[in-house]
């Protein structure tokens, strides 16, 4: 008996699909980086499964992940950020599946925040601004942002605008008058680093003014 696998033999365990995906977040907590991995199949029995990362680390050869419910997580300063690391799913000492990954190619930025929309009556436009923690970071500074907005009644009819700054102007004439809009923003690495879209920021809601019948313009909010 191997002693590794409970709830069935290790041979049975090897038939399961242990494919997983990971994302990194650099300087997510001061100078600390994080790495989060999860199985692609939510039905995998994770009872005895552990994750380990080896290689491209500082002062250690390997690190073990912490298990947080369905995800596996590391927060550390010890990522070299040069070269590929080997991330393995393990049962005891046995590796079930491994991936060689450069952590700078799976970066998921932090979600933007402080999204707001201000109507400029004189300019007949809306100024959208938001903030990102990445402006203060040493590594993942340059992001592409995706601003998405929709009329609240249009469930899946989002309009997307890509931009590299944290300010966007929406022309009043492009929006429906006297309508409630929802707007949100997310970010992705755009220079040197590769990876995934961040989570969406919290949505912001704003109403467009009525049309002023005499001038054909909208009333301010």
């Amino acid at each position: 008996e191997s002693g590794y696998a409970q709830n069935g033999d290790l041979e049975d365990a090897e038939l399961d699909d242990y494919s997983f995906s990971c994302y990194s977040q650099l300087e997510v907590n001061g100078s600390q980086h994080s790495l989060t991995c999860a199985f692609e199949d939510p039905d995998v029995n994770i009872t005895n499964l552990e994750f380990e990362i080896c290689g491209a680390l500082v002062e250690v050869k390997c690190l073990n992940f912490r298990k947080l419910q369905e995800i596996y997580f590391i927060e550390t300063k010890k990522f070299l950020l040069i070269g590929k690391s080997n991330i393995c799913v393990k049962v005891g000492e046995k590796s079930l599946t491994c991936k060689k990954i450069d952590l700078t190619t799976i970066v998921k930025p932090e979600a933007p925040f402080d999204l707001s929309v201000v109507y400029r009556e004189g300019a007949n436009d809306f100024v959208v601004t938001f903030n990102t923690s990445h402006l203060q970071k040493k590594y993942v500074k340059v992001l592409m942002h995706d601003v998405a907005y929709r009329q609240e009644k249009d469930e899946n009819k989002w309009t997307h605008v890509n931009l590299s700054s944290t300010k966007l102007t929406l022309l009043q004439r492009k929006l429906q008058p006297a309508a409630m809009y929802e707007i949100k923003v997310r970010s992705i690495p755009d220079h040197y680093f590769k990876g995934f879209w961040s989570e969406w920021s919290p949505s912001y809601y704003f109403r467009t003014p009525e049309i002023n019948n005499s001038s054909g313009e909208m009333d301010p909010i």
């Epitope: 290689g55 070299l80 590929k84 680093f193």
Partner: antibody, heavy 117, light 110 residues
């Protein structure tokens, strides 16, 4: 098959400059960490510099920091080493090396740089 | 910064076994992987051991690597010596974002 070929070496006077190139083929260049290592005549290996896959991360040995600059052009599969303020002690065979997928490196055949008046 | 110290030279007869040591001056030898390179005269280096004890494909199993925490050193052992093993051997470790090479050991096959 991994192939690395250095060029640009030669004779240069002290205080002069030289740019070495390393042409890469047989592997995914824009996925690889690259290094420059040198070997003075009859001496051991000395690591000089590395560059990350994207050019963002660059690091140097103290002996060349401020004088040498590593760079890469992923569109052409080329690695460079710009060497300024050269000294007699910089005379060596210069190798480019690929850092494999967290295993052994692959090395070029080297190019000789001679710094002499 | 640490140094990796190797004996200047070792020798052995064909068929015999030799061991080349690589001692780290400060910090733990366990803190990053050790690689070993072989450099035959007039050639560029090639990897014979990576990740402490792993052999690249094509390297004979006569080559083995190990780590000894108690002596803070790594070792390269070559058994069944043949004349083609005559070369310089270098150990190497990462030191943060720098690479540190040992001074090299000349192996002579008598």
């Amino acid at each position: 098959q991994v192939n690395l070929r250095e060029s640009g070496g030669g004779l240069v006077k002290p205080g002069g400059s030289l740019r070495l190139s390393c042409a890469a083929s047989g592997f995914t260049f824009d996925d690889s960490v690259m290094h420059w290592v040198r070997q003075a005549p009859g001496k051991g290996l000395e690591w000089l510099s590395l560059v990350g896959w994207d050019g963002f991360f660059t690091y140097y040995a103290d002996s060349v920091k401020g004088r040498f600059t590593i760079s890469r052009d992923n569109t052409k599969n080329l690695l460079y080493l710009q060497m300024n303020s050269l000294r007699a002690e910089d005379t060596a065979v210069y190798y480019c090396a690929r850092q494999g997928d967290y295993m052994g490196n692959n090395w070029g055949q080297g190019t000789l740089v001679t710094v002499s008046s | 910064n640490f140094m990796l110290t190797q004996p200047h030279s070792v020798s052995g007869s064909p068929g015999k076994t030799v061991t080349i040591s690589c001692t780290r001056s400060s910090g733990s030898i366990d803190s990053s992987y050790v690689q070993w390179y072989q450099q035959r005269p007039g050639n560029s280096p090639t990897t014979v051991i990576y990740e402490d004890d792993q052999r690249p494909s094509g390297v004979p199993d006569r080559f083995s690597g190990s780590i000894d925490s108690s002596s803070n050193s790594a070792s390269l052992t070559i058994s069944g010596l043949v004349t083609e093993d005559e070369a310089d051997y270098y150990c190497m470790q990462y030191d943060f974002h720098h690479l540190v090479f040992g001074g090299g050991t000349k192996l002579t096959v008598l």
